[in-house]
Interface confidence: medium
């Protein structure tokens, strides 16, 4: 009889990484599908994604830039990660047998942890990483911009396919690691000032800096996070005009 | 506050290998996935992989499968690249960064520079 | 992404009666012949249970008085008679192989008279 057993921390703050593992007795791993599926207290069923022992991965679009999952067949084991939690996270959490590639049915089920979100405990996390796909192409524009200070700039983006919001913009000074300006397309990071702003969805995205200070003048990358692995764009810089 | 403090520069002869390292503070390093990123002299970026260093778990960009080895030491909160058969391409400064919510990159490591000459 | 409307919300059932749930799909989950519906029940504390896999078989050791049938868009769950046992929340659920996405419908609570 084939039996899954949910392992994981109870209490986990939010911005945590969850990591949760299901060891599975009785059978092998080996061959079958094997997914997470959540349940917040009172609602219903939500499916998180699944594995194949192979490693190849399909996740949930809602989740899918939050959601890692890994298996190792020499433990019998497979693992979720879910990263940036919320208190929207808090749910019970399964692990399930996902019978075979057509039917998509559930046979087998862990009994079941309880995970939940909440600043009592637990330490401080971060992002997960997306699904599988094809490498998502960029065109960036232009290479080079001059402008003066005051003026007001727009570098586009385009993507070879639909990414939805998942795309962030970074500058970079000479010799500087770049910064994060913009997450999920139009979220101005904390400490960013207002003048910076983004749009845009699906495959065309844009970064606007409204009125240019001195200390704009920098090199612009866009970044895909829709698709594994991520990629940058090829870079805009701008430049005093002179 | 969150902080990384990466490895003075290298110099390598074709062929070698090196061990880039990254410390981290001001957060709890297990919870986070650090990310290594490339950016050669006058180029853009390019993402390398990232490690869970709650577990070790190593993702890879297809081009740096068997170039680059990511590690992490838990109780010294250092993330290690290892970049192996080095060639005069790998010439590049290297990026650690750390990846928060949405996938997006929040903090990055100084860089180190990697100069690979005969 | 197939949206899953169960109705209804909840029923109250008396015991040896005939209990009916309803799923209806956004749009139509048959493919390569079948019909990827499938229904598990849930009793608090305890994980669902499958109980029919695609639309109408019923799983091993489940009771024959559980039975689904339905294609395309339209599915239904029946208990007939209905059991003490029986009161829990019912799901449907289906498989729709592109976009790699599966949906749960939001449940039926059944309770028995």
């Known amino acids: 009889q084939v039996q899954l057993q949910e392992s994981g921390p109870g209490l986990v703050k939010p911005s945590e990484t969850l990591s949760l593992t299901c060891t599975v007795s009785g059978g092998s791993i080996s061959n079958y599908y094997w997914s997470w599926i959540r349940q917040p207290a009172g609602k219903g069923l939500e499916w998180i994604g699944r594995i194949y022992t192979s490693g190849s991965t399909n996740y949930n679009p809602s989740l899918k830039s939050r959601v890692t999952m890994s298996v190792d067949t020499s433990k019998n084991q497979f693992s979720l990660k879910l990263s940036s939690l919320t208190a929207a996270d808090t749910a019970i959490y399964y692990c399930a047998r996902y019978y075979d590639i057509l039917t998509g049915f559930f046979d087998y089920w862990g009994q079941g942890t309880l995970v939940t979100v909440s600043s009592g405990g637990g330490g401080s996390g971060g992002g997960g990483s997306g699904g599988g796909g094809s490498v998502i192409w960029m065109t960036q524009s232009p290479s080079l911009l001059s402008a003066s200070t005051g003026d007001s700039v727009t570098i586009s983006c385009r993507m070879s396919q639909d990414i939805s919001s998942y795309l962030a913009w970074y500058q970079q000074k000479p010799g500087k690691a770049p910064e994060l300006l913009i997450y999920a397309a139009s979220s101005l990071q904390s400490g960013v000032p207002s003048r910076f702003s983004g749009s845009g969805s699906g495959t065309d995205f844009t970064l606007t800096i409204s009125s240019l200070q001195s200390e704009d003048f920098a090199t612009y990358y866009c970044q895909q996070y829709d698709s594994f692995p991520p990629t940058f764009g090829q870079g805009t810089k701008v430049e005093f005009k002179r | 506050q969150v902080q990384f403090q990466q490895s003075g520069a290298e110099l390598a002869r074709p062929g070698a290998s090196v061990k880039l390292s990254c410390k981290a503070s001001?957060?709890?390093?297990?919870?986070?996935?650090m990310q290594w990123v490339k950016q050669r002299p006058g180029q853009g970026l390019e993402w390398i992989g990232t490690?869970?260093?709650?577990?070790?778990?190593?993702r890879y960009s297809q081009k740096f499968k068997g170039k680059a080895t990511l590690t992490a030491d838990k109780s010294s909160s250092t993330a290690y690249m290892q970049l192996s058969s080095l060639a005069s391409e790998d010439s590049a400064v290297y990026y650690c960064?750390?990846?928060?919510?949405?996938?997006?990159?929040?903090?990055w490591g100084q860089g180190t520079s990697v100069t690979v000459s005969s | 992404n197939i949206v899953l409307t169960q109705s209804p919300a909840s029923l109250a059932v008396s015991l040896g009666q005939r209990a009916t749930i309803s799923c209806r799909a956004s749009?139509?989950?048959?493919?390569?012949?079948?019909?990827?519906m499938h229904w598990y029940q849930e009793k608090p504390g305890q994980p669902p249970k499958l109980l029919i896999f695609?639309?109408?078989n019923l799983e091993s050791g489940v009771p024959a008085r559980f039975s689904g049938s339905g294609s395309r868009t339209d599915f239904t769950l029946t208990i007939d008679p209905v059991e003490a046992d029986d009161a829990a929340t019912y799901y449907c659920?289906?498989?729709?192989?592109?976009?790699?996405?599966?949906?749960f419908g939001g449940g039926t609570k059944l309770e028995i008279r």
């Open positions: 960064t750390r990846r928060r919510g949405y996938d997006a990159m929040d903090y």
């Open positions: 001001g957060y709890t390093f297990t919870s986070y996935w």
């Open positions: 490690i869970y260093p709650g577990d070790g778990d190593a």
């Open positions: 749009e139509s989950v048959d493919s390569y012949g079948s019909s990827f």
């Open positions: 695609l639309a109408s």
């Open positions: 659920q289906q498989n729709n192989e592109d976009p790699n996405m599966y949906t």
